[in-house]
């Protein structure tokens, strides 16, 4: 086991694409570097033009490869991926159903936006609101990673602290990523502020994206309890009877 | 200390526009929000709308339409600009100072000015 | 838009007497309300932010209470100074909404 719980599982035999997806049947790690804990983690991704749809694209390989470093499923570590501007646009609800290839498909495929304006205030009131809602795995950490390179007007950010208390009170971690020179610097170090689980990472551009991901996925990581062990199935007892 | 001071017209004819002017001292306009509230004679007051320290506004979706907050922060000036006045506008207007920012929720109005008095009469 | 009903409208105290005006709302407000004192001028002064917070230099004397939809403002010792007219404001929603005000005099 790597530090900070990364778990480096056996390698499964892939599952051939015309197999339905069943969740015992995982489909193997693509990387050494693997979480596998108990965790809901939501990516929100800033879709500003703050970021240049070549930029955005390198954002978007960063979502993948954290995707193939963790353990996926329904069990172990879900997944939500939302797109905002000045709404928000979900692109992987937690509660999908699917094999971690095509949510990584999913995740690729998002489109980019680039709006004069990225509202973090309106993707938190909307995560708080219908991502975590409601709690249907409270066993689990729940971790937001904000991936924001922009700036919110401050009429928008209005009710900014309102919903950094409502995820405080539902034990929602959120690891704000600043991504270049706007990113709204005020509002993470407020991120900051509210838990101390809350850590910030200022990164100078995308580019530091992949530089930092291992450190972000260890943080995160390190955040959420371990799965259970699979119970194994009960052990069919043999009676051999002696011939009398 | 915080000061905020108005200076209107006083008398304005029905059908025409109000302009008011509100200068502040003992504060920066980028880092506080300034409101306007009005209150027409023997009644209560009425929130109209703000702007942040960012030049963003709010407005009461009752007068949207026809007001307009704007601000000069290099002379500490802002001002209310409200059209097709009728004579239910006539009110004392007052500018507030509003700590509205990224980092605070409690959207008291602490310093107030004075208030200018406006007649809306042919 | 969040109606605010100040209750009563007016009210003759002496005083030293203690003193309490009541604000409630049409909906729950989450104690984001505050009181501002009117004096016979006009000058208009903040008293309490957040249902409960004493603004800088308010006297002691000044408290505020309340939750969900009823919220209420207390002066515990009626000072000459204090007669003025009483208006609470819900920041909840927008638009920010005020109450009609309550006018206190002295017997």
């Known amino acids: 086991q790597e530090p900070g719980g990364l778990v480096v599982p056996p390698t499964d035999a892939p599952v051939s694409s015309t197999t339905p997806y069943v969740e015992d049947t995982p489909e193997p790690p693509l990387h050494n570097f693997y979480c596998s804990k108990l965790l809901d983690l939501v990516f929100l991704l800033d879709g500003s033009y703050r970021l240049s749809e070549a930029e955005f694209e390198v954002l978007k390989a960063f979502v993948v490869g954290t995707m193939e470093r963790l353990h996926i499923s329904q069990k172990r570590i879900r997944v939500a991926v939302v797109e905002y501007h000045d709404g928000s646009h979900a692109y992987l609800e937690l509660r999908a159903r699917k094999r971690p290839s095509e949510l990584r498909r999913i995740a690729s495929q998002i489109k980019y936006v680039g709006s004069q304006l990225a509202s973090t205030s309106e993707v938190l009131k909307y995560t708080l609101f219908q991502i975590f809602g409601k709690i249907d795995r409270p066993e689990a950490s729940r971790v937001i990673l904000l991936l924001t390179a922009s700036q919110e007007p401050q009429r928008m950010a209005r009710y900014f602290t309102r919903y950094l208390q409502g995820f405080k009170k539902k034990k929602v971690i959120l690891i704000p990523v600043g991504i270049g020179p706007h990113a709204n610097l005020k509002q993470i170090r407020l991120i900051e502020k509210q838990a101390p689980e809350n850590k910030a990472f200022l990164l100078s551009g995308v580019d530091e994206l992949e530089q930092r991901r291992d450190e972000i996925i260890n943080y995160l990581c390190d955040l959420a309890p371990e799965a259970p062990a699979p119970s194994k199935p009960p052990q069919v007892a043999h009676i051999t009877v002696s011939p009398g | 200390q915080v000061q905020l001071k108005e200076s209107g017209p006083g008398l304005v004819a029905p059908s025409q526009s109000l302009s008011i002017t509100c200068t502040v001292s003992?504060?920066?306009?980028?880092?506080?929000?300034v409101d306007w509230v009005r209150q027409p004679p023997g009644k209560g007051l009425e929130w109209l709308g703000m702007?942040?320290?960012?030049?963003?506004?709010d407005y009461n979706s009752a007068l949207k339409s026809r007001l307009s907050i704007t601000k000069d922060n290099s002379k500490s000036q802002v001002f209310l600009k409200m059209n097709s006045l009728q004579t239910d506008d006539t009110a004392r207007y007052y500018c507030?100072?509003?700590?509205?920012?990224?980092?605070?929720?409690?959207?008291?109005?602490?310093?107030w000015g004075q208030g200018t008095s406006v007649t809306v009469s042919s | 838009d969040i109606q605010m009903t100040q209750s009563p409208s007016s009210l003759s105290a002496s005083l030293g007497d203690r003193v309490t005006i009541s604000c409630s709302a049409s909906?729950?407000?989450?104690?984001?309300l505050n009181w501002y004192q009117q004096k016979p001028d006009g000058a208009v002064k903040l008293l309490i932010f957040?249902?409960?917070s004493l603004h800088s230099g308010v006297p002691s004397r000044f408290s505020g209470s309340g939750s969900g939809t009823d919220y209420s403002l207390t002066i515990s010792n009626l000072e000459p100074e204090d007669i003025a007219t009483y208006y609470c404001?819900?920041?909840?929603?927008?638009?920010?909404?005020f109450g009609g005000g309550t006018k206190l005099e002295v017997k």
């Open positions: 909906q729950d407000i989450n104690k984001y």
């Open positions: 507030v100072r509003d700590p509205a920012d990224y980092g605070n929720y409690d959207y008291a109005l602490d310093y």
């Open positions: 957040y249902t409960s």
């Open positions: 702007i942040w320290g960012d030049g963003s506004t």
């Open positions: 003992g504060f920066s306009l980028t880092d506080y929000g």
């Open positions: 404001q819900q920041y909840e929603k927008l638009p920010w909404t």
